[in-house]
């Protein structure tokens, strides 16, 4: 395939030479290239009052190549087009025009939007989100124990971000209140407050030992027994029951 491309041989004239420069197959002293070597394009360049033939490996910007049996020519792209494969297939439009299916348009057709970065008409892309994850364990202050009412969360990913005219992304995180069967925290699970209570209890006992006259009623009353906590929660729960017939869902929007 890389053999010569079957060009018809021109009849030699007295001023036609075959010892040509720069890709010419035949040339003359006055007109430059008259024909080109295979895979080269013949272009006429105006120099002052005369036109000189030159052979180029590719057509200049704004031109496209057409093959003929005896010559490859460069032809101008359409007026609104900067780069093209042919007059009907533009690949880059001039400033102020948008490329769509090889054509240059001053505005994009219905259902498409202009991308001002690529200067193309592109499909409107709507946001796509994944399915929700399962609800997280019911938690309060980072713990899954030592309480009755907490919150649980579920999340989803954005699979496709929207284009300028596309539908916005929905929330990617959702939180709701939840109720669990109350369970005591094991030693390892105790949070900061549990440790503080323990420390206060120890201090109280130390004070008892060192100064029997020190009154520790105030301190003692600040520590509720599990039964007291349970009763208090039961009362609060009755008050809230009317409100809490349906679990409320609170959407935390972290739209991308």
């Amino acid at each position: 395939q890389n053999a010569s491309r079957g060009r018809r041989q021109r009849r030699m004239h007295p001023n036609v030479s075959q010892g040509c420069q720069g890709g010419c197959a035949t040339c003359s002293d006055y007109n430059g290239c008259l024909s080109c070597k295979p895979r080269l394009f013949f272009v006429l360049e105006r120099i002052g009052m005369k036109q000189i033939g030159v052979c180029l490996s590719s057509c200049p910007s704004g031109y496209y190549g057409t093959r003929y049996p005896d010559i490859n020519k460069c032809t101008k792209c359409k007026v609104d087009c900067d780069t093209c494969f042919n007059k009907n297939f533009c690949t880059k439009c001039k400033s102020g025009f948008y490329l769509h299916l090889g054509k240059c348009l001053d505005s994009c057709p219905e259902g498409l939007e202009a991308n001002n970065h690529t200067m193309e008409c592109v499909s409107i892309v709507h946001c796509e989100a994944s399915e929700w994850s399962p609800w997280s364990p019911c938690m309060k202050k980072g713990k899954t124990c030592g309480f009755k009412r907490g919150t649980e969360t579920r999340v989803r990913d954005i699979l496709q971000h929207p284009s300028a005219k596309g539908n916005l992304c929905p929330p990617t995180s959702e939180t709701r209140t939840c109720i669990v069967q109350r369970k005591k925290c094991s030693k390892g699970e105790r949070g900061k407050k549990g440790r503080e209570r323990k420390r206060k209890k120890l201090n109280k006992e130390e004070r008892k030992e060192t100064s029997s006259s020190s009154d520790s009623k105030g301190l003692e009353s600040s520590i509720e027994t599990p039964d007291q906590q349970e009763n208090k929660e039961r009362q609060q729960q009755q008050k809230r029951r009317a409100r809490d017939k349906q679990q409320k869902s609170v959407s935390v929007s972290t739209v991308h």
Epitope: N2, T66, N86, F89
Partner: antibody
């Protein structure tokens, strides 16, 4: 002489991406656009898109627009075609070809892509 | 998109006989007097090979028994006389508009 040598066969899982290379020699790499065409088993030819090696500008068939990316490395005269979010229907032989004055005159030997779970 | 319809889908011809394959475009592939129609030959396990460009021009190195004709929407590839090495699938392809498209192919076999 002009030669286009493509990378070897690939086996991918659905949802994955593949990047096929096409190394050009025997001509000035930046002179002609490189196009990619695919052929599913026992099927016809389907144009995917093109890249101008001179400036990296590319254009794609609308069918592949959101999944394909074409790049090039002028220092090694190599063109690349990356296809993402693969599905079983993408199983095909992928060809690169030089585009000279509105026809594909030189072709790579083809790269077989199999997409299977 | 320009749809190219090739006929017949397959063709059995005796050695030395003429084979004719047609390609019909859903719209004209002509512009400024040029026809943007090409023909390719593909043998099993090989890439396509350019035979005819711009409807009727023979690619260099291709035997003269291959010829192309037509304009607008109707194009023909003729092989005369058919030789054993011509057993292959033949595709038409238009370069006039984005996206570039190919016909579905015509499989040539020997009778």
């Amino acid at each position: 002489q002009v030669q286009l040598v493509q990378s070897g066969a690939e086996v991918k899982k659905p949802g994955a991406s593949v990047k096929v290379s096409c190394k050009a020699s025997g001509y000035t790499f930046t002179d002609y656009s490189i196009h990619w065409v695919r052929q599913a088993p026992g099927q016809g030819l389907e144009w995917i898109g093109y890249i101008y090696p001179s400036n990296g500008d590319s254009g794609y068939n609308q069918k592949f627009k959101n999944r394909v990316t074409m790049t090039r490395d002028t220092s090694t005269s190599t063109a690349y075609m990356e296809l993402s979010r693969l599905r079983s229907e993408d199983t095909a032989v992928y060809y690169c070809a030089t585009y000279f004055a509105n026809n594909f005159d030189y072709w790579g030997q083809g790269t077989t892509l199999t997409v299977s779970s | 998109d320009i749809v190219l319809t090739q006929s017949p889908a397959s063709l059995a011809v005796s050695l030395g006989q003429r084979a004719t394959i047609t390609c019909k475009a859903s719209q004209s592939v002509d512009y400024d007097g040029d026809s943007y129609m090409n023909w390719y030959q593909q043998k099993p396990g090989q890439p396509p090979k350019l035979l005819i460009y711009a409807a009727s021009n023979l690619e260099s190195g291709i035997p003269a028994r291959f010829s192309g004709s037509g304009s607008g929407t109707d194009f023909t590839l003729t092989i005369n006389p058919v030789e054993a090495e011509d057993v292959a699938t033949y595709y038409c392809q238009q370069s006039n508009e984005d996206p570039l498209t190919f016909g579905a192919g015509t499989k040539l076999e020997l009778k």
